[in-house]
Interface confidence: low
């Protein structure tokens, strides 16, 4: 019996087609993705093949002005229109709190939304009961398939799930649910979830009874053969894990941003054993037409956005590199731009001993969610900035000891190379890392722009000195694992909305051209 | 682990430079000392060496009209500006009574003020509590250093400390404090104090755990080798005392009146034992330029700034250091400002392959003729800029081979240190010089901001590549000895008036705050 699994993950509000790097579409003839194009391909496969499931592995929320304005209603509406069969909750589904998940999505979705390792407690338990499930048994042709969901246990550090949701270890939580499915004589089980490729592989290895793992969170691109676009495969598609009980378990993920549709064909024997698996992500490029009815609906929903966001704020004459491939690994000029805007927004020159009350900015690279292409006449709009800074946060002022900052910079690279969001972009700071040293001891130079000086220049960080720093509220609140900031900050003052800070700066500067100038170095 | 101790003692209100005999300066070209000159040397050493402490062994108070008028406020202000790490109380610090010490100095100093053998009693005890300390543990690089203070026990006979301060025997009082530091695992301890050379030597002999003694009060001049001025050495620098427990303890003092900066290098082993010590007082003569920002501050305190009366173009919140002492020797923020304006005035984004046609600026430091003080409400007028750029030149565009630029940068430092005008300020260039190499081979790194790129970043200069550069017409015409530019330029286009370029930029930016950010470095 053959099953076709179509899957998406980490779509991040890319309802419209995008450019190849998943930023705003500029040249339509070269654009990719978007729900209208996705629907065309899904329908084509549904017509051609008998047993098809369309699954999403989380993080539909957050990423463009669509989410800023519609706050998840757009996710429910268009996923319903595409007739998704199931979705797993991602960490970003909690970005607007539990209420921001329940009202627009959980109550409106016509498909099951799953997570086995999220347990509600307190007053939330009854309120959310039945709105998401640990698993769902779906009829597919003459057979049934069990879908069991999971969500990154790091979600409390990554989003805003509140205090009434407990995120358990994925493997610990999944096993009893899979066992339950087995007792229900469900012998074909897909784990669908959002915890990253490493955890996906562990689930494949450790959870007895899981036949296929469909993942997300790490934006992992897998491909067999010559990849069709710029993404470099992290492995073959599907990635085969040998489970502890000796089975070959296919693990898949489909990069991110709706650029690809994951396409996996699984052959089961009569006992539900996987006897073959093959496929590849399908690049949703312009050779696939956008479905006219979905496109018309998109255009209708777009009207509200256009009024909101299409005014030019200023111009860039350089590519504003906000890609995760840059900003999570090294100094990126988008990080420099944002930090420069953050400092500029905080000029308070009051005291002759100090050229300014604050000179430093830190910014988690993972908070930079999109690049901005300069080849659209250089125009920068609110919409562009909302894709870069989609989280609706604020840029806040904190006071920290030097020792806390040192810990923060150690944390920045404690697991360097895994494309994790804690890698810090900076302003008013020169940092040198030595990645050959052990985690926790990798910062070999940390110079900071003086404030108690008339000519700003860089001096070594002093462990016992108290410094003011501008940073995203997300970091002030300990996000991306920066617990030391939350625990050790001496003062915290809320600031202005992140997009507004950057848009004001760009409007003021008129033309911008930030460079990669050596703020962050590796020795 | 190596520690550099910079030290002064018995400065006695010599904030301005003095004649060779420490009286009022008459012929400026032969004058010495003063806080502006001291700051230049201190900063030079801080930049060059990793672990530096700047210490004062007392008697800053008393000696010139500065103390008569400002009553110690000048000491706090300028010692803060110089970023002293610690000071010991001298007898003269009590000349205006305890109140005359507490209000202007103890409450305003941003560095610890120390004395272990002064004990407060009665109502004074709570009032003065925490304002001076017996010792302070200072972080220096990755290590900590304990500084324990002492003051001449003769102070009640020499000054006006009142009845609520008890001056104990130095050795008796120091030992328990040193013992306390040892229990805190502080294994590198400096005794810093003001009791005279004989007591300094006794402390070195008798106080177990003291590694170095930095003294004052007796105006002792120590020197190894041929002394550089009129003072006759009382012994070698450092003076080595063998302690009762068999250790070699270096003892130093730096004459008086700010004429010398004591310079002592100590090498400690892992257990905090002194394994070597060497150095000499540095004569602060006119070969060392006075730091312009400190000098400007001195002049302000001395005569009050004139009000400017012309139109405001924009504001600066930093000191725009256009002094020859800076701009002819190192990166100066006035040079950075002007170069940034020159690039901004030449934004011509025409080709998708190039973010801009030009990214580089060079500017002879000798062409910057004045600083601009930010302490006039930050106001910048055309008149100010005309003082900076008085020659009515233009900022031009040239095309040069990389090899020509390399020659230009070699010329920039071919006779470095003579305050000659050819020292280049830059924009879009990162240069590293090694002045220990022979002239013509001093440029060890020359990275330039790419133009044929979508994200500007720094790449090594290529000898055979052709680059566009913005520079003053003076340089394009071979001025300041830049014959190679005149001889080898491939194209030269006249540009806009120099003052106008800068004034337009300042008007556009509204508020400026250029920094010294590492464009020019010395290895």
């Amino acid at each position: 019996w053959e099953l076709t699994i179509l899957h998406t993950n980490d779509v991040h509000s890319r309802l419209e087609q995008t450019s190849e790097d998943s930023s705003k579409c500029v040249n339509a003839s070269r654009c990719m993705g978007g729900v209208a194009r996705l629907f065309t391909k899904v329908q084509q496969i549904r017509r051609a093949e008998p047993n098809v499931l369309l699954l999403d592995a989380g993080d539909q929320y957050q990423g463009t002005i669509w989410f800023t304005v519609y706050k998840g209603a757009e996710v429910a509406h268009f996923m319903n229109a595409l007739r998704y069969d199931a979705m797993a909750l991602g960490n970003h589904e909690f970005d607007n709190g539990v209420e921001g998940l329940i009202e627009p999505l959980l109550k409106e979705a016509k498909f099951p939304i799953l997570s086995a390792n999220i347990k509600a407690k307190g007053p939330l338990a009854s309120q959310i009961s039945g709105l998401y499930l640990p698993y769902k048994v779906l009829p597919v042709g003459d057979e049934v398939v069990g879908i069991v969901g999971y969500t990154s246990k790091e979600t409390p550090f990554l989003s805003n799930p509140g205090t009434n949701l407990v995120f358990e270890d994925e493997i610990t939580a999944l096993q009893p649910e899979v066992d339950k499915l087995k007792t229900l004589n469900v012998n074909k089980i897909i784990a669908l979830g959002h915890s990253g490729f490493e955890t996906d592989k562990l689930i494949a290895q450790k959870v007895r009874g899981v036949d296929v793992v469909v993942g997300g969170h790490s934006n992992t691109f897998l491909y067999t053969g010559n990849p069709p676009s710029k993404e470099v495969p992290a492995g073959k598609y599907p990635f085969i894990v040998t489970s502890d009980d000796g089975r070959k378990v296919p693990v898949v993920q489909a990069y991110a941003f709706g650029k690809y549709l994951g396409y996996l064909k699984i052959e089961f024997d009569e006992r539900g054993n996987v006897i073959s698996s093959h496929g590849n992500p399908i690049l949703l490029n312009s050779s696939i037409p956008e479905d006219p009815s979905i496109k018309a609906d998109i255009n209708k929903w777009r009207i509200k956005l256009d009024n909101y966001s299409t005014q030019e704020l200023g111009k860039t004459i350089v590519y504003l590199d906000g890609s995760s491939q840059s900003c999570r690994f090294r100094e990126c000029n988008m990080g420099n731009l944002i930090c420069d805007a953050m400092i500029n927004n905080n000029l308070r020159h009051a005291d002759e001993m100090f050229w300014n009350h604050v000179s430093m900015c830190i910014l988690n690279g993972g908070g930079i969610r999109s690049p901005i292409d300069e080849r659209n006449n250089g125009t920068i709009t609110w919409e562009n900035l909302a894709a870069v800074l989609p989280f609706g946060g604020t840029f806040d002022l904190v006071q920290l000891k030097g020792s806390t900052l040192k810990k923060a910079f150690e944390h920045s690279v404690h697991r360097y190379g895994q494309s994790t969001g804690e890698f810090l972009q900076v302003g008013g700071i020169h940092v040198v890392y030595d990645l050959s040293r052990k985690p926790g001891d990798r910062v070999v130079k940390l110079d900071v722009l003086c404030t108690k000086c008339r000519v700003p220049s860089y001096d070594p960080l002093k462990m016992d000195e108290i410094y003011k720093v501008i940073l995203p509220n997300f970091l002030a609140n300990g996000g991306d694992g920066f617990q030391m900031i939350k625990d050790e900050l001496l003062r915290h003052d809320s600031g202005d909305q992140d997009i507004n800070v950057v848009s004001t700066y760009i409007s003021k500067m008129k033309v911008i051209y930030p460079a990669v100038e050596g703020r962050i170095k590796f020795s | 682990w190596e520690l550099t101790i910079l030290h002064t003692n018995d400065v006695h209100s010599r904030l301005e430079q003095t004649s060779e005999d420490s009286s009022k300066c008459v012929n400026a070209s032969r004058c010495m000392g003063g806080v502006a000159r001291l700051f230049t040397k201190v900063q030079q050493i801080r930049r060059a060496e990793p672990n530096v402490l700047l210490l004062d062994a007392g008697d800053q108070y008393q000696g010139t009209i500065w103390f008569t008028v400002y009553k110690g406020a000048e000491v706090a202000h300028f010692m803060n500006a110089l970023r002293y790490d610690a000071m010991a109380l001298g007898n003269h610090e009590f000349d205006n009574g305890v109140e005359g010490l507490i209000e202007p100095l103890l409450k305003e100093a941003k560095f610890p003020i120390l004395s272990a053998n002064i004990k407060a009693k009665g109502p004074l005890a709570s009032q003065i509590s925490g304002l001076y300390l017996p010792y302070k543990v200072l972080p220096v690089g990755d290590e900590v250093v304990g500084i324990v203070g002492y003051t001449s026990k003769e102070t009640p006979f020499l000054s006006n400390p009142g009845t609520n301060l008890v001056f104990e025997d130095e050795i008796t009082a120091l030992q328990p404090e040193v013992d306390k530091l040892k229990t805190l695992n502080v294994n590198k301890i400096i005794a810093l104090g003001h009791s005279g050379f004989e007591t300094d030597k006794l402390i070195a002999q008798k106080v177990r755990g003291v590694d170095v003694v930095v003294g004052g009060h007796s105006n002792t001049f120590l020197y190894t080798g041929n002394p550089p001025s009129k003072e006759v050495p009382a012994g070698k620098y450092p003076f080595i005392v063998t302690s009762d427990d068999g250790r070699k303890v270096p003892v130093v003092q730096a004459y008086a009146f700010g004429k010398y900066l004591g310079y002592l290098k100590i090498e400690f082993d892992e257990r905090g034992n002194v394994i070597s010590s060497h150095g000499n007082p540095i004569l602060l003569n006119s070969s060392i330029p006075e730091d312009p920002s400190i000098k400007a501050d001195i002049n302000k305190w001395r005569i009050k700034l004139d009000n400017y009366s012309t139109q405001e173009l924009g504001k600066t919140i930093v000191y725009l250091d256009g002094s020859s002492q800076s701009c002819r020797f190192r990166e100066c923020n006035m040079g950075n400002l002007i170069c940034d304006a020159m690039i901004n005035n030449n934004l011509r984004h025409a080709d998708e392959m190039f973010w801009n046609h030009v990214s580089m600026c060079i500017l002879n430091g000798g062409g910057i003729r004045s600083p601009i003080d930010e302490r006039n409400n930050g106001t910048i007028t055309w008149e100010n800029l005309a003082a900076v750029l008085p020659f009515g030149g233009t900022f031009d565009l040239v095309q040069l081979k990389g090899s020509t630029l390399k020659k230009a940068f070699e010329h920039s430092v071919h006779r470095y240190g003579q305050s000659t005008g050819e020292f280049l300020q830059v924009g879009g260039i990162h240069v590293v010089y090694d002045l220990s190499r022979k002239p013509g081979d001093r440029v060890v790194k020359l990275d330039v901001l790419c133009t044929k790129c979508r994200v500007p970043s720094y790449d090594p200069l290529k000898m055979d590549e052709i680059y566009k550069v913005i520079l003053p017409n003076f340089l394009a015409n071979g001025g300041d000895g830049f014959q190679m530019i005149k001889d080898e330029l491939l194209r030269h286009d006249s540009g806009d008036q120099d003052i106008n370029v800068v004034s337009t930029y300042i008007s556009k930016m509204k508020v400026i705050y250029p920094a010294v950010e590492g464009r020019i470095k010395f290895s």
């Epitope: 470099v232 495969p233 992290a234 491939q325 690994f329 090294r330 697991r415 360097y416 190379g417 895994q418 990645l435 050959s436 040293r437 052990k438 590796f522 | 090594p460």
Partner: antibody, heavy 120, light 106 residues
Framework: QIQLQQSGPELVKPGASVKVSCKAS????????MNWVKQSHGKSLDWIGY????????SYNLTFKGKATLTVDKSSTTAYMHLNSLTSEDSAVYYC?????????????WGQGTLVTVSA | DVVMTQTPKFLLVSAGDRVTITCKAS??????VAWYQQKPGQSPKLLIY???TRYTGVPDRFTGSGYGTDFTFTISTVQAEDLAVYFC????????FGAGTKLELK
């Protein structure tokens, strides 16, 4: 999958120089340092140094400073090691190696090795 | 440079034996030690890093331990395919390897 494909064996005369190549595939070349390791016949391993393909920055074992020069060509995802003034002491198998994660060490991925023989 | 003194140079083993190799660092290297296996004509293979963490896919008969200056590598039950040279390596200060231990059949 991740592969490091090195150039073939070299027979060179004393005093000459040689350039060994290492073609990387299956991962983001610029994101990981490329290390080089020497193994003389029947001997242990000696770390030569590494180069960061992203910016061309390199770090050398002092023993090999002046002997080895490391370069990269990002466009072809290839790393190179140039060895100069060769003597019989330089006869060895030379490996390129990539770290597990972006560490300098913990070499999880190795080239197949290039035998360099220095002989008159 | 940190010197890694590896002992013994040779080990004669039979299938099923338990084997222990030691490496002593000339100064503390924390836990920044890796172990490699090299078979004739092949490139080395990473087995253990951070002194005790098994690299992906390495059988659990291979274990490592130690901290500071003394490190141990153990094969709990030697199999025929384990005959090879084993190297330790430190990455705490620059990067150096041990001289190697050759496992040979008795």
């Amino acid at each position: 999958q991740i592969q490091l494909q090195q150039s073939g064996p070299e027979l060179v005369k004393p005093g000459a120089s040689v350039k060994v190549s290492c073609k990387a595939s299956g991962y983001a070349f610029a994101s990981y340092n490329m290390n080089w390791v020497k193994q003389s016949h029947g001997k242990s391993l000696d770390w030569i140094g590494y180069i960061d393909p992203y910016n061309g920055g390199s770090s050398y074992n002092l023993t090999f400073k002046g002997k080895a020069t490391l370069t990269v060509d990002k466009s072809s995802t290839t790393a190179y090691m140039h060895l100069n003034s060769l003597t019989s002491e330089d006869s060895a198998v030379y490996y390129c190696a990539r770290g597990y994660g972006n560490y300098k060490a913990w070499f999880a991925y190795w080239g197949q090795g290039t035998l360099v023989t220095v002989s008159a | 440079d940190v010197v890694m003194t590896q002992t013994p140079k040779f080990l004669l083993v039979s299938a099923g034996d338990r084997v222990t190799i030691t490496c002593k660092a000339s100064q503390s290297v924390s836990n920044d030690v890796a172990w490699y296996q090299q078979k004739p004509g092949q490139s080395p293979k990473l087995l253990i890093y951070y002194a005790s963490t098994r690299y992906t896919g390495v059988p659990d008969r291979f274990t490592g331990s130690g901290y500071g200056t003394d490190f141990t590598f153990t094969i709990s039950t030697v199999q025929a395919e384990d005959l090879a040279v084993y190297f330790c390596q430190q990455d705490y200060s620059s990067l150096t390897f041990g001289a190697g231990t050759k496992l040979e059949l008795k």
